[in-house]
C-alpha cells in the first residue's frame, strides 16, 4: 500500500538569503511530502459470487486495503447500513462475529478481509441485482464502505462477468487524528511548492532529480500506492429487496465472481482472473482530500443509471456506539 518518495538530499543552504529559516522551509516540504505519499488512501473491495449449482447461494468477500487497524466490519444488503440496508453480519476482530439469517457463515479470511456465505432457496432467494455492502471502520481512516451486486446478466451461462462498476461510500468526516494532520500537511506542502516555483531552486546533489520529480511521482499512478476512487455516500438502487431465506447446505462447483473494487478495471476479465487474486486490478488514480477530487490519468467511470448519491443520515459517528467502536 505504501510507496516511498525519493526525497532529494539537500545540500546545506548557502548563508545569506536562505539562512536557518530557509533550511527549515526546504526540509519541511520533503518531510510532509514523504508523509503524504506514504499515508496512502484506504481502499475497500467487494466480490460477490453466485454458486452455479445453487443459484440462491451467494458468497460475499470484502477486503480493506489501508494501513489503519480495522475495528469493525458490517455486511449489509439492500443498500448501505443505516440507509435502508439490513445488517447481515457484524465482525469485530477481537470481540467476535455475529450474523443473522440468511447469512450462514461469516468469517475472517485474513486480518483485513472477510467472507460471508448467504443462502436461500426458491422464491425467497435474493435476486441477481441485490446490493451487498461492506463497511470497514478503521483507525485512523474512519469508515469506508463499498457496495456491489451481481449484474442481472450474470447467468451461469456466461463465461465472464460484465465489468463491475465501483461503488464506495466514505464517511470523510470520520477521518480524524493523523489523517487530519496529514491533510493539513499536504495542503501546506502544495502551498510551499507553489511558493517555491517563484524562487531559485535549492542546490541539490547532482545525482538527484529536481523538486518537481518527486512531486510528480507522488501524484502518479502506481501499483503499490493508489488512492481510491471515492464516490461519497453512493449506493445502488435496487428494486429487488431480499426476503428472509431458508438455510441450505453449501454446494461446490464453478462460480462467477462480480468484483467491485474501489478502482474500476475498464476491461472485462474472466473468472480465472478473479480467482487468481483477491485484490482486483486497479485503474485510474484518484485522490480525495476532504471532498476535493484530483485525478491523474483517465476520468472516473460514471455512476450510471443505477446509482444514487445521498448523505449518510447517521453522520460520521454511525459506526460507533454499542457495536464495539468507541
Amino acid at each position: 500500500m505504501r510507496t516511498e518518495a525519493q526525497v532529494p538530499a539537500l545540500q546545506p543552504p548557502e548563508p545569506g538569503l536562505e539562512g536557518a529559516m530557509g533550511h527549515r522551509t526546504l526540509v519541511l516540504p520533503w518531510v510532509l511530502l514523504t508523509l503524504c505519499v506514504t499515508a496512502g488512501t484506504p481502499e475497500v473491495w467487494v466480490q460477490v459470487r453466485m454458486e452455479a449449482t445453487e443459484l440462491s447461494s451467494f458468497t460475499i468477500r470484502c477486503g480493506f486495503l489501508g494501513s489503519g487497524s480495522i475495528s469493525l466490519v458490517t455486511v449489509s444488503w439492500g443498500g448501505p447500513n443505516g440507509a435502508g440496508g439490513t445488517t447481515l453480519a457484524v465482525l469485530h476482530p477481537e470481540r467476535g462475529i455475529r450474523q443473522w439469517a440468511p447469512a450462514r457463515q461469516a468469517r475472517w479470511e485474513t486480518q483485513s478481509s472477510i467472507s460471508l456465505i448467504l443462502e436461500g432457496s426458491g422464491a425467497s432467494s435474493p435476486c441477481a441485482n441485490t446490493t451487498f455492502c461492506c463497511k470497514f471502520a478503521s483507525f485512523p481512516e474512519g469508515s469506508w464502505e463499498a457496495c456491489g451486486s451481481l449484474p442481472p446478466s450474470s447467468d451461469p451461462g456466461l463465461s465472464a462477468p460484465p465489468t463491475p462498476a465501483p461503488i464506495l461510500r466514505a464517511d470523510l468526516a470520520g477521518i480524524l487524528g493523523v489523517s487530519g494532520v496529514l491533510l493539513f500537511g499536504c495542503v501546506y506542502l502544495l502551498h510551499l511548492l507553489r511558493r517555491h516555483k517563484h524562487r531559485p531552486a535549492p542546490r541539490l546533489q547532482p545525482s538527484r532529480t529536481s523538486p518537481q520529480a518527486p512531486r510528480a511521482r507522488a501524484w502518479a499512478p502506481s501499483q503499490a500506492s493508489q488512492a481510491a476512487l471515492h464516490v461519497p455516500y453512493a449506493t445502488i438502487n435496487t428494486s429487488c429487496r431480499p426476503a428472509t431465506l431458508d438455510t441450505a447446505h453449501p454446494h461446490g462447483g464453478p462460480s462467477w465472481w462480480a468484483s467491485l473494487p474501489t478502482h474500476a478495471a475498464h476491461r472485462p476479465q474472466g473468472p480465472a482472473a478473479w480467482a487468481s487474486t483477491p485484490i482486483p486490478a486497479r485503474g485510474s488514480f484518484v485522490s480525495v482530500e476532504n471532498g476535493l477530487y484530483a485525478q491523474a490519468g483517465e476520468r472516473p467511470p460514471h455512476t450510471g443509471p443505477g446509482l444514487t448519491l445521498f448523505p449518510d443520515p447517521r453522520g460520521p459517528r454511525a459506526m460507533e456506539g454499542p457495536l464495539g467502536v468507541r
Epitope: 443505516g82 457484524v90 476482530p93 477481537e94 467476535g96 486480518q111 456506539g321 457495536l323
Partner: antibody, heavy 114, light 113 residues
Framework: EVQLQQSGPEVVKPGASVKISCKAS????????INWVKQSHGKSLEWIGD????????NYNQKFKGKATLTVDKSSGTAFMGLRSLTSEDSAVYYC???????WGQGTSLTVSS | DIVMTQSPSSLSVSAGEKVTMSCKSS????????????LAWYQQKPGQPPKLLIY???TRESGVPDRFTGSGSGTDFTLTISSVQAEDLAVYYC?????????FGGGTRLEIK
C-alpha cells in the same frame, strides 16, 4: 453513553406468559443488536439469543427455542423478550446486553410462583 | 455447544496479593483467519449486572484498571489480578465469544480475607 433500561420485576403464576422490555437510549437504536441473558439465583449466566433491529432477525440458543421469543420495536427503541409456559425453572434475573456484551441492562427479576 | 470450565470455583486472598483464575474451553476459541481468540472475561459484583473486563482474551475494555490481565490461547485462558483490591470482591466469568451459543463458564468467586 449507551444505556439499557429494563422493565420492573415480575411475579407470575406457573403456565402463564410474560414479556419483559429493554429500552435503549443514548445512541441510534438501529445500531443496537440486543442479547438476552438468563441468570438463575446464585448460578452462572446463560445466553438466550440475540435480535437484529434492522429486520427483527434472531438467533436463539437451542435450549430456549420455544421458551423465549425476541422482538423489537424500532420506533420506540425497545427490545422485548416474551417467555411462555412458565415454570419455577424460569425464575431468574434476565438481562439485556448490547451486541458484544459491553453494556448491560440492570436486570429484570422474574419469579414464577403459585 | 462449547463448554467453558472455570477453576477454582472460589478463592480467598488478602488485599495486595496476586490472583490467577483459569478458564478452559472444550473447543478452540482461536479464529484462524485473523489469529484472534474470541474469549471474554466479566466481573459481576453482588446485586449488579456483569461488567465486561477483557475481550479477545487479552484486550482490556476501556476504563478497566491495568491490574486486570487476560492471557492464553486456543483452549486455555487465564485472568490475573496483579494486586487485589477490596473492590475486586466479585464473581468472574469467562465466555465463549467464538460461536453460538455464547456459553459462559460457571464462575470463580473471589473473596477478600
Amino acid at each position: 453513553e449507551v444505556q439499557l433500561q429494563q422493565s420492573g420485576p415480575e411475579v407470575v403464576k406457573p403456565g402463564a406468559s410474560v414479556k419483559i422490555s429493554c429500552k435503549a437510549s443514548g445512541n441510534t437504536f438501529t445500531d443496537y443488536f440486543i442479547n438476552w441473558v438468563k441468570q438463575s439465583h446464585g448460578k452462572s449466566l446463560e445466553w438466550i439469543g440475540d435480535i437484529n433491529p434492522d429486520n427483527g432477525g434472531t438467533n436463539y440458543n437451542q435450549k430456549f427455542k420455544g421458551k423465549a421469543t425476541l422482538t423489537v420495536d424500532k420506533s420506540s427503541g425497545t427490545a422485548f423478550m416474551g417467555l411462555r409456559s412458565l415454570t419455577s425453572e424460569d425464575s431468574a434475573v434476565y438481562y439485556c446486553a448490547t451486541l458484544y456484551f459491553d453494556y448491560w441492562g440492570q436486570g429484570t427479576s422474574l419469579t414464577v410462583s403459585s | 455447544d462449547i463448554v467453558m470450565t472455570q477453576s477454582p470455583s472460589s478463592l480467598s486472598v488478602s488485599a495486595g496479593e496476586k490472583v490467577t483464575m483459569s478458564c478452559k474451553s472444550s473447543q478452540s476459541l482461536l479464529n484462524s483467519g485473523n489469529q484472534k481468540n474470541y474469549l471474554a472475561w466479566y466481573q459481576q459484583k453482588p446485586g449488579q449486572p456483569p461488567k465486561l473486563l477483557i475481550y479477545g482474551a487479552s484486550t482490556r475494555e476501556s476504563g478497566v484498571p491495568d491490574r486486570f490481565t487476560g492471557s492464553g490461547s486456543g483452549t486455555d485462558f487465564t485472568l490475573t489480578i496483579s494486586s487485589v483490591q477490596a473492590e475486586d470482591l466479585a464473581v468472574y466469568y469467562c465466555q465463549n465469544a467464538h460461536s453460538s451459543p455464547y456459553t459462559f463458564g460457571g464462575g470463580t468467586r473471589l473473596e477478600i480475607k
